[in-house]
C-alpha cells in the first residue's frame, strides 16, 4: 500500500516556470526553461496552451525539471506553461499549470510611443511628464534629448511604460526614447518617433526619428551601478538597425557609463 492519506488539494499548488538567460532573447540563443514543483514530482510536462501534445516530458524524481531549447528561432517564441504529476495520481491528472511564461525571440523590440502628459505645450512654471510606452513589462527605458549626447534619464519599469518628469523651465526641446531588456543578452527596441515639447504659443509637432537632426542615437544599455558598461558589441543584437540622428556611424558611438539618473 503506497498511498498514504493525502492532504487537501490545496497542498498540490501549481509549479513555477522561469527562463534562463531571459524571457526576451535574440534568435540563436540557447534558452533553458525551468519548471519547479513545490514538492518532489515524478514527471514534468512543458506545453504550449492550445497545442494538444506536450512539447517535452522530463521524468525526474525531484522538484526541478529543465527543458533545453537550443538556438531558438522566432517560431519557438510564444506562451509556455508546465505541469507536474506523481505516479499515484489518476490517469491524465496533472497539477494546475504554472502561470504563463511568454518567450519572445526577436532581433529587435517594437517601437515605443512617446507622449506628453498632460500635453506637449508647457505653461510657465509647469512640469511635464513624458511617457515612453512599449508592449513589454519589466523593461529599461531610456529618454534622449536632441543636442544632448548622453541619455537624459533611465527608468526600469515593471509596467510596459515609464514616465519621465521634465521641469517646466527646461522642458522645451525635442525628445525620443527607446527601451531594452534589463540585462544581457540585451535586446533593444526601435527608437520612438520624436516628440517636440514647446512653450505656450509655439506649435508642437512629431516627426520620425530618422529625420530629426542633431540628436544622438542610443548608446548601449546601462550596466548595474559600479559595473563596467558593456561594450557595444556585447549588447547590440545581430541585425538591429537603429537610425542614428547624427551623421555618424553606429560604430562611432561611445558606450555611456551607467548614469545616476540626474533628471533635467
Amino acid at each position: 500500500d503506497i498511498t498514504p492519506s493525502v492532504p487537501p488539494a490545496s497542498y498540490h499548488p501549481k509549479p513555477w516556470l522561469g527562463a534562463q538567460p531571459a524571457t526576451v532573447v535574440t534568435p540563436g540563443v540557447n534558452v533553458t526553461l525551468r519548471c519547479r514543483a513545490p514538492q518532489p514530482a515524478w514527471r514534468f510536462g512543458l506545453f504550449k496552451p492550445g497545442e494538444i501534445a506536450p512539447l517535452l516530458f522530463r521524468d525526474v524524481s525531484s522538484e526541478l525539471a529543465e527543458f533545453f531549447l537550443e538556438e531558438v528561432t522566432p517560431a519557438q517564441g510564444g506562451i509556455y506553461r508546465c505541469c507536474y504529476r506523481r505516479p499515484d495520481w489518476g490517469p491524465g491528472v496533472w497539477s494546475q499549470p504554472s502561470d504563463v511564461l511568454e518567450l519572445l525571440v526577436t532581433e529587435e523590440l517594437p517601437r515605443p510611443s512617446l507622449v506628453a502628459l498632460p500635453g506637449p505645450v508647457v505653461g510657465p512654471g509647469a512640469n511635464v511628464s513624458l511617457r515612453c510606452a512599449g508592449r513589454l513589462r519589466n523593461m529599461s527605458f531610456v529618454l534622449y534629448r536632441e543636442g544632448v549626447a548622453a541619455p537624459l534619464q533611465y527608468r526600469h519599469s515593471a509596467q510596459p511604460w515609464a514616465d519621465f518628469t521634465l521641469l517646466g523651465a527646461r522642458a522645451p526641446g525635442t525628445y525620443s526614447c527607446y527601451y531594452h531588456t534589463p540585462s544581457a543578452p540585451y535586446v533593444l527596441s526601435q527608437r520612438s518617433e520624436v516628440l517636440v515639447i514647446s512653450w505656450e504659443g509655439e506649435g508642437p509637432e512629431a516627426r520620425p526619428a530618422s529625420s530629426a537632426p542633431g540628436m544622438q542615437a542610443p548608446g548601449p544599455p546601462p550596466s548595474d551601478p559600479g559595473a563596467q558598461a558593456p561594450s557595444l558589441s556585447s549588447f547590440r543584437p545581430r541585425g538591429l538597425v537603429l537610425q542614428p540622428l547624427l551623421p555618424q556611424t553606429q560604430d562611432s558611438w561611445d558606450p555611456a557609463p551607467p548614469p545616476s539618473d540626474p533628471g533635467v
Epitope: 503506497i2 501534445a53 506536450p54 499515484d88 489518476g90 490517469p91 496533472w94 499549470p97
Partner: antibody, heavy 117, light 108 residues
Framework: EVQLLESGGGLVQPGGSLRLSCAAS????????WTWVRQAPGKGLEWVSG???????NYAQNFQGRFTISRDNSKNTLYLQMNSLRAEDTAVYYC???????????WGQGTLVTVSS | QSVLTQPPSASGTPGQRVTISCSGS????????VSWYQQLPGTAPKLLIY???NRPSGVPNRFSGSKSGTSASLAISGLRSEDEADYYC?????????FGGGTKLTVL
C-alpha cells in the same frame, strides 16, 4: 459560484449521432482534467472519457472509436461527440472535474440520452 | 461487471454505524487512491471522501474512509434517514477510471 451545465441530450435513433456539451463557470477551465461519466437507468456509474490539461484524451475501452471528447478552453466548454449510437448507450451523461490525486469533485446535473427507434 | 466490487445493498437503523466495502486489486486500489460518492435519488453524485480518507468541506464527520491493501471501506456513524442513497467507490489504474457497482443503503 462553481457550476457545470450539460446540454445536448435527447432522443436519437440507433446508428445516429449526438453531441453533448458541458459549460463550466466559476473557475479556470483550461487548468483542469474534465471527464464524462454515464449512468444507465437503474445502473451504476460508468466512466466514459477524459480530457487532460494537455496530451491525448483517454477513453474507456467500450467507447474508443465511437466517442470523441474535446474541449474549447476559450468557451469553458467540454464536448462529447457520440457516433454509431446503440440502445445500450441510453443513459444520463454527467460531466465532472477531476481533482488531485484522483477523484471527481464537481459534477453537472446530467443530460439524458435516449437511443431508440 | 465492475472491476471494483461492492455489496449491492446495506442497511441500518438510525444512530447505527454502517460500513460499506470496496474490493479491487493491486493494479487499482492497491497502488492508488480511493474516493467515495453519495447519490441521492434523482440527483448527481456527490463527492464524500477522496484520497482514501479525506472529507471535502461540507461533508459531515460521520462519514469516514479507510484503505488497507487492495480493499477500501466507507463508514457512516450515527446513521440518519437522509443517508439513504446509493454509494459508489472509485479508483483507477494506469489508463482508466474505475467505479464500483454501487451499494444501495437503506435506513430502516
Amino acid at each position: 459560484e462553481v457550476q457545470l451545465l450539460e446540454s445536448g441530450g435527447g432522443l436519437v435513433q440507433p446508428g445516429g449521432s449526438l453531441r453533448l456539451s458541458c459549460a463550466a463557470s466559476g473557475f479556470t477551465f483550461s487548468d483542469y482534467y474534465w471527464t464524462w461519466v454515464r449512468q444507465a437507468p437503474g445502473k451504476g456509474l460508468e466512466w466514459v472519457s477524459g480530457s487532460p490539461v494537455f496530451g491525448a484524451a483517454n477513453y474507456a475501452q467500450n467507447f474508443q472509436g465511437r466517442f470523441t471528447i474535446s474541449r474549447d478552453n476559450s468557451k469553458n466548454t467540454l464536448y462529447l461527440q457520440m457516433n454509431s449510437l446503440r440502445a445500450e448507450d441510453t443513459a444520463v451523461y454527467y460531466c465532472a472535474k477531476a481533482g488531485i490525486p484522483g477523484h471527481f469533485d464537481i459534477w453537472g446535473q446530467g443530460t439524458l440520452v435516449t437511443v431508440s427507434s | 461487471q465492475s472491476v471494483l466490487t461492492q455489496p449491492p445493498s446495506a442497511s441500518g437503523t438510525p444512530g447505527q454505524r454502517v460500513t460499506i466495502s470496496c474490493s479491487g486489486s493491486s493494479s487499482n486500489i492497491g497502488n492508488n487512491y480511493v474516493s467515495w460518492y453519495q447519490q441521492l435519488p434523482g440527483t448527481a453524485p456527490k463527492l464524500l471522501i477522496y484520497g482514501n480518507s479525506n472529507r471535502p468541506s461540507g461533508v459531515p464527520n460521520r462519514f469516514s474512509g479507510s484503505k488497507s491493501g487492495t480493499s477500501a471501506s466507507l463508514a457512516i456513524s450515527g446513521l440518519r434517514s437522509e443517508d439513504e442513497a446509493d454509494y459508489y467507490c472509485q479508483s483507477y489504474d494506469s489508463s482508466s477510471w474505475l467505479f464500483g457497482g454501487g451499494t444501495k443503503l437503506t435506513v430502516l
